[in-house]
């Protein structure tokens, strides 16, 4: 029996929002599973030098390097990094093991390098070497999975040429529509590359790695379903594999399926058939049409015909380059304060897009849903009735698309006033943009009905934070109004709001707000 190491070296990855990561290098609370770095005795080294497995860390990630020594009693230690000594505070865990930790908060290039730890216990001395580097995510890729037929077997292999090596899973569903959403109980996931059960209603393959998750659906024509009102369309880029599945169920085995491209039967070797009996003893047949690497001349109408079902077609379009088709003209909306409203963008794209919604420099997750007509739609409803500019941005491998929206919230003006020695100003962010009136209050006009037209200057300005408009009106001080109360009023179709200002001397003014609907 070969000995396990006398010391244990572990890496603890802290989540970005982990408030448990302490500033000290002693012992932060840990919620994540520690990863064993397998500290092994370094060959050809004098003394007991242990070397931990190399540690690769994402930029800005927070980690703890930790060493456990199964020796109670006095332990002293010292960390050395780039010829500098760093503080080291050992402690003991519940099981009496000595624990030494080094916390690296928000990893940067300057924190990469060799960390040496010297430990001295009553029994022996140890030197432990950690090598920490920043993970080069520039080399990372995540490619959409594609299908291949397994050699000599009726099975599909799912392939995603990604770095790091992705985890591949099949996502299967046997019901229709909404119930096939990712987290639905009807959905079954199989973490394997090869799939033999190819009779399901909905078949997708997904690949995931550090960059995220990409999925490809097996394009299917179901002859037992009523055809869509518009012809289903499948886009592919030159060189990509084409896979279309035709599925049909019949009371007995007495029927056959065929594929045609533009009324010409597919060549041998471009299709294969499978059949099985379902639980109620009906026969299910599927016929795959496939081309391992498509060219422009593979474009056209692919029709699946059955001797017992009406035939159905799909339009396959082969493109040289990916695209995103949508109208990019900006759109303005005005809604009431409590009105339910969502922005939406309808687009046609290939390959599938990655998208974001942005408001006030903050990004929001973007969901997209396929429509029956080959278009997709992305909606954004989480605006919380904040007026301003909203941006939809989409991109795929070959194209980019940006669309601007302006949201205005209809509300009556709210007036804020300020004054200086030479002028008085009023501001309002009501919508529609308000109009302004200034009135002088005097003995002759105690109700402030005497209108002021001289020295008034109105403007609208863009409040930079949300891209929403603010209207302002400024009254330049004249001898005629000095020492008087003046009233500024902002009004729009939803109401009026006023502020009264005493024009005497500079400094804080008592403002009296009148709300007149």
């Amino acid at each position: 029996n070969q000995d396990l190491p006398v010391i244990k070296c572990v890496l603890i990855n802290h989540k970005n929002n982990d408030s448990s990561v302490g500033k000290s290098s002693s012992y932060p609370m840990v919620s994540e599973s520690p990863e064993d770095l397998g500290c092994a005795l370094r060959p050809q080294s004098s003394g007991t030098v242990y070397e931990a497995a190399a540690v690769e860390v994402d930029v800005s990630a927070s980690i703890t390097l930790q060493v456990l020594v199964d020796a109670p009693g006095n332990i002293s230690c010292l960390w050395v990094f780039k010829h500098s000594s760093l503080n080291c505070q050992p402690h003991f865990d519940l099981q009496n093991r000595g624990v030494v930790s080094m916390v690296i908060l928000k990893m940067t290039e300057t924190q990469a390098g060799e960390y040496l730890l010297f430990i001295q216990s009553e029994a022996t001395n140890y030197t432990i070497l950690f090598t920490v580097s920043i993970r080069n995510t520039l080399l990372y890729t995540l490619r959409r999975p594609y299908f291949r037929k397994m050699e000599n077997q009726d099975a599909l292999v799912c392939i995603s040429e990604s770095v790091p090596e992705p985890i591949v899973e099949w996502v299967l569903c046997d019901s229709q529509g909404e119930s096939c959403k990712e987290e639905s109980p009807a959905v079954v996931k199989k973490e394997e590359k090869v799939l033999h059960e190819l009779f399901g209603t909905d078949i997708r393959c997904c690949a995931r790695n550090e960059l995220g998750r990409e999925c490809t659906r097996l394009f299917t024509i179901d002859l037992n379903q009523t055809p869509q009102t518009t012809l289903p369309q499948l886009f592919l880029k030159v060189g990509e594999p084409l896979w279309i599945r035709c599925k049909a169920v019949h009371v007995n085995h007495g029927f056959g399926l065929t594929w045609e491209l533009e009324n010409k039967a597919l060549e041998e070797g471009n299709y294969f058939e499978m059949s099985t009996y379902s639980t109620n003893r009906t026969m299910i047949r599927i016929l795959f049409a496939f081309v391992s690497s498509v060219a422009r001349n593979d474009t056209g109408y692919y029709t699946c015909s059955s001797s017992k079902h009406p035939s159905q077609s799909a339009l396959v379009t082969i493109v040289e380059k990916g695209f995103i088709n949508a109208t990019n003209s900006s759109e303005d909306y005005e809604i009431d304060q409590y009105e339910e409203f969502c922005f939406s963008v309808r687009f046609k794209a290939y390959p599938q897009i990655r998208c974001t919604w942005t408001f006030s420099r903050k990004s929001f997750p973007c969901e997209q849903k396929g429509l029956d007509n080959g278009y997709s739609i992305s909606k954004f409803c989480n605006h919380k009735h904040q007026p301003g500019e909203y941006i939809f941005h989409a991109e795929n491998d070959d194209a980019q698309f940006t669309k601007m929206f302006t949201l205005n919230i209809r509300r009556k003006p709210q007036v804020l006033a300020e004054a200086s020695a030479s002028q008085a100003s009023c501001f309002s962010d009501g919508y529609p943009l308000p109009s302004w009136t200034w009135k002088k209050c005097s003995d002759k006009s105690p109700n402030c009905t005497e209108e002021i037209t001289e020295g008034v200057w109105n403007r609208k300005a863009n409040r930079k934070v949300f891209g929403q408009w603010v209207s302002s009106s400024t009254l330049n001080m004249s001898e005629a109004i000095k020492g008087f109360l003046v009233k500024c009023c902002a009004y729009n179709s939803l109401g009026t709001s006023c502020e009264t200002i005493l024009l005497n001397s500079p400094g804080p003014f008592p403002f009296i707000q009148d709300n007149i609907s």
Partner: antibody
């Protein structure tokens, strides 16, 4: 190679004490905890406590705290476990085992059968 | 103390079959370790830190799990694998062992 060799079987009367020894070889004695684990006939394993050789650090399982004493002699690389006030339910095989930093018992003695019978 | 419950108590299988042994902890533990014990012998360490194979242990033994539920799997039973298997934890101050699962020949 690492070896833990225990003393021979013992037969004791109820109320008596027994002292089992565990001599280690093949590694540096004060580098690892020595643990004592017992197993009653046909039953599971029960941890009794441990001792770190060369220090005065000992941990006892609460169930044995008042009856068990663990000692060691670094000059002979031997650990001892003494159990007093024996009763018939103490009849068991007593093992010494070495603990490592992974908190597992990687090497075991061959076991010492202690029979308590009147 | 953390109680480890092993199931089943006895598993009757034939050589070549797959054996799946469970170990359930009364509260969450960091790691589980597995031992094999044959009659008249001391236990032998099989797996440490839930899934790591101890030195000299054949690859047909594997461990998995997290939190409170752990599994030892023997992919294809060999005649020498018929024995009692114990799980052990040391997350708390004192270690505890499961009650054992006896894998016997059917």
């Amino acid at each position: 190679q690492v070896q833990l060799v225990q003393s021979g079987a013992e037969v004791k009367k109820p109320g008596a004490s027994v002292k089992v020894s565990c001599k280690v070889s093949g590694y540096t004695f004060p580098y690892y905890w020595i643990n004592w684990v017992r197993q009653a006939p046909g039953k599971g394993l029960e941890w009794m406590g441990n001792i770190y050789p060369g220090s005065s650090i000992i941990n006892y399982n609460e169930n044995f705290k008042n009856r068990v004493t663990m000692t060691e002699d670094t000059s002979t690389d031997t650990a001892y476990m003494e159990l007093s006030s024996l009763r018939s339910e103490d009849t068991a095989v007593y093992y010494c085992a070495r603990r490592n930093v992974y908190l597992t018992f990687d090497y075991w003695g061959q076991g010492t059968l202690v029979t308590v019978s009147s | 103390e953390i109680v480890l419950t092993q199931s089943p108590a006895t598993l009757s299988l034939s050589p070549g079959e797959r054996a799946t042994l469970s170990c359930s902890a009364s509260s969450s533990v960091s790691y589980i370790h597995w031992y094999q014990q044959k009659p008249g012998q001391a236990p032998r360490l099989l797996i440490y830190d839930t899934s790591k194979l101890a030195s000299g242990i054949p690859a047909r033994f594997s461990g998995s799990g997290s939190g409170t539920d752990f599994t030892l799997t023997i992919s294809s039973l060999e005649p020498e694998d018929f024995a009692v298997y114990y799980c052990q934890q040391w997350t708390s101050k004192s270690p505890t062992f499961g009650g054992g699962t006896k894998v016997e020949i059917k």
